[in-house]
Interface confidence: low
């Protein structure tokens, strides 16, 4: 006769591991006992449970309530256990004897797989700002036995680099995801994807980018100067920028105070009438935590009766 | 068998710290997760964070970040969790929990926590 | 956070009822969803894994099943024992949230 065992058990950290030992026999023999030993190389052979024909299951103290004979129905030669609720330190090299009667003893050794599937973990680096060179964005760490595989799923250009830390009986690898940060990447989604054999699909952990910028400042309204002239409603200057954090903006007249009457609203500059006193160069100040820009204008309201003199002077002239 | 035994009931006044301890037993305390659940009276379940006492990594729910620690003592199997600047929306009971790996199979019987001036 | 919404709040059911208690995630959480029991003044106990892998000591008329973001808990047979508040757990993403929970009393 001959033992049938597997090579290698493989069982996800807590599930039961099915340990198989069956005897292949002629007809007429029959198994004794069976005994199952932890049998890892410079560890005495460690005795898990006996199985014997007559007295049934014997689990040695160290084993209490976690070895059991599979479910019935049961085949007398079958000496299989049930390890209940692995864990990592069960990972080793175990030993099924089988003794029969009229044909001995026989052995057959298995290594037991417990894989620990991995919680992983994703830390954003450093606050982005557009301008830094390469930087890092996240790091995403997991440990698991064995190695897990961690990669990045996302639509952003950037570069990868990973690094492993052995311990006895499992490893952590983390993978830093390294970037130069843009504007256009803000809102964009970093997903770090872990892969592992004790997962029933793979993990995935996302972080949304934010890159600090600000824009070039401008001032629209002046595009058509014929229209600041004096006695004009309704003037307003608005000043244009974007930026991450949102920018806060800030009025003032470079050439004295703001004359009275104009009203300062966020982004807008809103004039009452307009009179040549308006006229004068304005700055528009747009600042956020990152950084702060300033753009100037010169308005020069229009009296139409100093224009006609003008252009009387000038008809004359000609 | 698997056993999860914390200490007993604390009342702490506004602004005060509480460190809760969760004794493991009956398993390898290095190869399992240990989690922090709350829950307040009458209400659900919340997740406050987890220890890995293996390479003592942590996780924690950023509703609690800064203000809470979870750490662990290989030596003598026990996870802790301290939760500083209590206020009275703090008052539960709060539970250890072991994850497996990622579902919690054996609690700890609960720490009541009550804060009050 | 991934929102896990349980329903009913309530429910009310004979001895020897079929039961069915529903959780709905905000979004895909694959099978990572566990069953937890509580009765008054303990501490959850763990009922279903993985969505339908019951967990040890577990009766079976307790089942589990779903993927996605649909789950439920079915009791096959309610028996007098089973009084308890029940909850749902996402474990797909942290932080790892759990249903309002559905308290299940004899009629």
């Known amino acids: 006769g001959e033992l049938e065992t597997s090579d290698v058990v493989t069982v996800v950290l807590g599930q039961d591991a099915k340990l198989p030992c069956f005897y292949r026999g002629d007809s007429g023999e029959q198994v004794g006992q069976v005994a199952w030993a932890r049998a890892d190389a410079g560890e005495g052979a460690q005795e898990l449970a006996l199985l014997h024909s007559k007295y049934g299951l014997h689990v040695s103290p160290a084993y209490e309530g976690r070895v059991e004979q599979p479910p019935p129905p049961r085949n007398p030669l079958d000496g299989s256990v049930l390890l209940r609720n692995a864990v990592q330190a069960d990972e080793g090299e175990y030993e099924c004897r089988v003794s029969t009667f009229p044909a001995g003893s026989f052995q057959a050794r298995l290594r037991l797989r417990v894989l620990v599937p991995p919680l992983p973990s994703l830390n954003p680096g450093p606050a982005l700002e557009e301008g830094q060179g390469l930087t890092l964005a996240a790091s995403c760490t997991a440990e698991g036995s064995p190695a897990p595989s961690v990669t990045w799923d996302t639509e952003v250009k950037g570069t990868t680099s990973s690094r492993s830390f052995k311990h006895s009986r499992s490893a952590a690898v983390t993978s830093e995801f390294h970037l130069v940060p843009s504007r256009s990447m803000n809102g964009q989604p970093l997903t770090c994807v872990v892969s592992h054999p004790g997962l029933l699909q793979d993990q995935r952990i996302t972080h949304i980018l934010h890159v600090s910028f600000l824009a070039e400042a401008s001032v629209r309204g002046l595009e058509d100067q014929n229209l600041w002239h004096v006695g004009r409603e309704g003037a307003m200057l608005k000043c244009l920028s974007e930026g991450q954090p949102p920018p806060s903006y800030n009025w003032t007249r470079l050439d004295g105070p703001l004359p009275s009457g104009v009203r300062v609203d966020g982004d807008t500059l809103g004039f009452p009438p307009l009179t040549t006193e308006h006229s004068g160069i304005y700055v528009c100040h747009v600042s956020n935590e990152f950084s702060s820009r300033d753009s100037q204008v010169t308005v020069d309201v229009l009296d139409p009766q100093e224009d006609s003199g003008k252009q009387v002077d000038l008809v004359s002239a000609s | 068998q698997v056993q999860l035994v914390q200490s007993g009931s604390e009342l702490k006044k506004p602004g005060a710290s509480v460190k809760v301890s969760c004794k493991a037993s009956?398993?390898?305390?290095?190869?399992?997760?240990i989690h922090w659940v709350r829950q307040a009276p009458g209400q659900g379940l919340e997740w406050i964070g987890w220890i890995y006492p293996g390479n003592v990594n942590t996780k924690y729910n950023e509703r609690f970040k800064g203000r809470v620690t979870i750490t662990a003592d290989k030596s003598t199997n026990t996870a802790y969790m301290e939760l500083s600047s209590l206020r009275s929306e703090d008052t539960a009971v709060y539970y250890c929990a072991r994850s497996n790996p990622y579902v919690m199979d054996y609690w700890g019987q609960g720490t009541s926590v009550t804060v009050s001036s | 956070d991934i929102q896990m919404t349980q329903s009913p709040s309530t429910l009310s059911a004979s001895v020897g009822d079929r039961v069915t208690i529903t959780c709905r995630a905000s979004q895909s959480v694959n099978n990572d969803v566990a069953w937890y029991q509580q009765k008054p003044g303990k501490a959850p106990k763990l009922l279903m894994y993985y969505a339908s892998n019951r967990f040890t000591g577990v009766p079976d008329r307790f089942s589990g099943s779903g993927y996605g973001t649909d789950f439920t808990l079915t009791i096959s047979s309610l028996q007098a024992e089973d009084v308890a508040v029940y909850f749902c757990?996402?474990?797909?993403?942290?932080?790892?949230?759990f249903g309002q929970g559905t308290k299940l009393e004899i009629k």
């Open positions: 757990q996402q474990a797909y993403r942290s932080p790892y949230t």
């Open positions: 009956g398993y390898t305390f290095t190869s399992y997760y």
